[in-house]
Interface confidence: medium
């Protein structure tokens, strides 16, 4: 059974992940971002179901495409400190949260999504899990 300390750790990790995803989304949604039109043309895969931590497998599988899109979108008015580091940090958190005991085959929805919809989906996921923990 999960202890209060492990629950607290999970909560902190989810909050960190949430902040990272929100930071990316805020950068993208910045009205001064001249690359938004182009970024919105890259389609991301969305999870059919995302209700448990193990479903973060679906986010993990989309981190490489996310990194590439963010790299391509860098401009004077949209600049993330270090995309590689940021994605690497997200990856570490995701791996810890989802655990490695069970290897889940991610099931994707038929509909694809823009980067904004993709990020919003995973932000909602984090918020939902955090609320159950608190």
């Amino acid at each position: 059974a999960p202890t209060s300390s492990s629950t607290k750790k999970t909560q902190l990790q989810l909050e960190h992940l949430l902040l990272d995803l929100q930071m990316i989304l805020n950068g993208i949604n910045n009205y001064k971002n001249p690359k938004l039109t182009r970024m919105l043309t890259f389609k991301f895969y969305m999870p059919k179901k995302a209700t448990e931590l193990r479903h973060l497998q679906c986010l993990e599988e989309e981190l490489k495409p996310l990194e590439e899109v963010l790299n391509l979108a860098q401009s004077k008015s949209f600049h993330l400190r270090d995309t590689k580091d940021l994605i690497s940090n997200i990856n570490v958190i995701v791996l810890e949260l989802k655990g490695s005991e069970t290897t889940l085959m991610c099931e994707y929805a038929d509909e694809t999504a823009t980067i904004v919809e993709f990020l919003n989906r995973w932000i909602t996921f984090c918020q939902s899990i955090i609320s159950t923990l608190t």
Epitope: P34, R38, T41, F42, K43, P65, V69, T112
Partner: antibody, heavy 124, light 107 residues
Framework: EVQLVQSGAEVKKPGESLKISCKGS????????IGWVRQMPGKGLEWMGI????????KYSPSFQGQVTISADKSISTAYLQWSSLKASDTAMYYC?????????????????WGQGTAVTVSS | DIQMTQSPSSLSASVGDRVTITCQAS??????LNWYQQKPGKAPKFLIY???NLETGVPSRFSGSGSGTDFFFTISNLQPEDIATYFC?????????FGPGTKVDIK
């Protein structure tokens, strides 16, 4: 080999309808935007619009919005361009082209693979 | 819509010459500019993306440069097979507009 094969030349009368096709092969058709480009006789290239076959998301140039319909059938890896009522001014060569991509998915960086073109002649 | 202009509209040069075509955008498009080659009766061919990146398999005598609103396309050593019309295209903002083209032929 990645390729786009278009349907054959068409000769139509003003007011008739028409649907031309573009079949993709050699790559994951659902993951790449397909664009349509018009070239009137002796003229330059005009970007008409694009479709993402994976979810049928479609974007039109304002010049062509309402004039044509772009669609796709992902089950047969085919994109379409159609007119409900042709005009003489629709006489042109129409090309379909794939937008290149990264991570095995489309992210506009130019149209890297082109169909051979479909000549459409509208004359009474 | 972003307007694209090209100059010259046509040019004639000798085999071995260095040829440069200019493309101008009506607003800043960063480096989101592509170049295509179209030979008579054929479909366009993709040459350069993002202003200066050569598409795989394109001869190194072709090159591109520029950013913002001003772009350049150069053929460093003109060959007979380079006789074609060259088009620039912006893909920074929808709709993705083409330049009117520059026709290149041999003297």
């Amino acid at each position: 080999e990645v390729q786009l094969v278009q349907s054959g030349a068409e000769v139509k009368k003003p007011g008739e309808s028409l649907k031309i096709s573009c079949k993709g092969s050699g790559y994951r058709f659902t993951n790449y935007w397909i664009g349509w480009v018009r070239q009137m006789p002796g003229k330059g290239l005009e970007w008409m619009g694009i479709i993402y076959p994976g979810d049928s998301d479609t974007k039109y140039s304002p010049s062509f919005q309402g004039q044509v319909t772009i669609s796709a059938d992902k089950s047969i890896s085919t994109a379409y361009l159609q007119w409900s009522s042709l005009k003489a001014s629709d006489t042109a060569m129409y090309y379909c082209a794939r937008h290149g991509g990264y991570s095995g998915r489309s992210y506009y960086y130019g149209m890297d693979v082109w169909g051979q073109g479909t000549a459409v002649t509208v004359s009474s | 819509d972003i307007q694209m202009t090209q100059s010259p509209s046509s040019l004639s040069a000798s085999v071995g010459d260095r040829v440069t075509i200019t493309c101008q955008a009506s607003q800043d498009i960063s480096n989101y500019l592509n170049w295509y080659q179209q030979k008579p009766g054929k479909a366009p061919k993709f040459l350069i993306y993002d202003a200066s990146n050569l598409e795989t398999g394109v001869p190194s005598r072709f090159s591109g440069s520029g950013s913002g609103t001003d772009f350049f396309f150069t053929i460093s050593n003109l060959q007979p097979e380079d006789i074609a019309t060259y088009f620039c295209q912006q893909d920074d903002n929808l709709p993705f507009t083409f330049g009117p083209g520059t026709k290149v032929d041999i003297k």
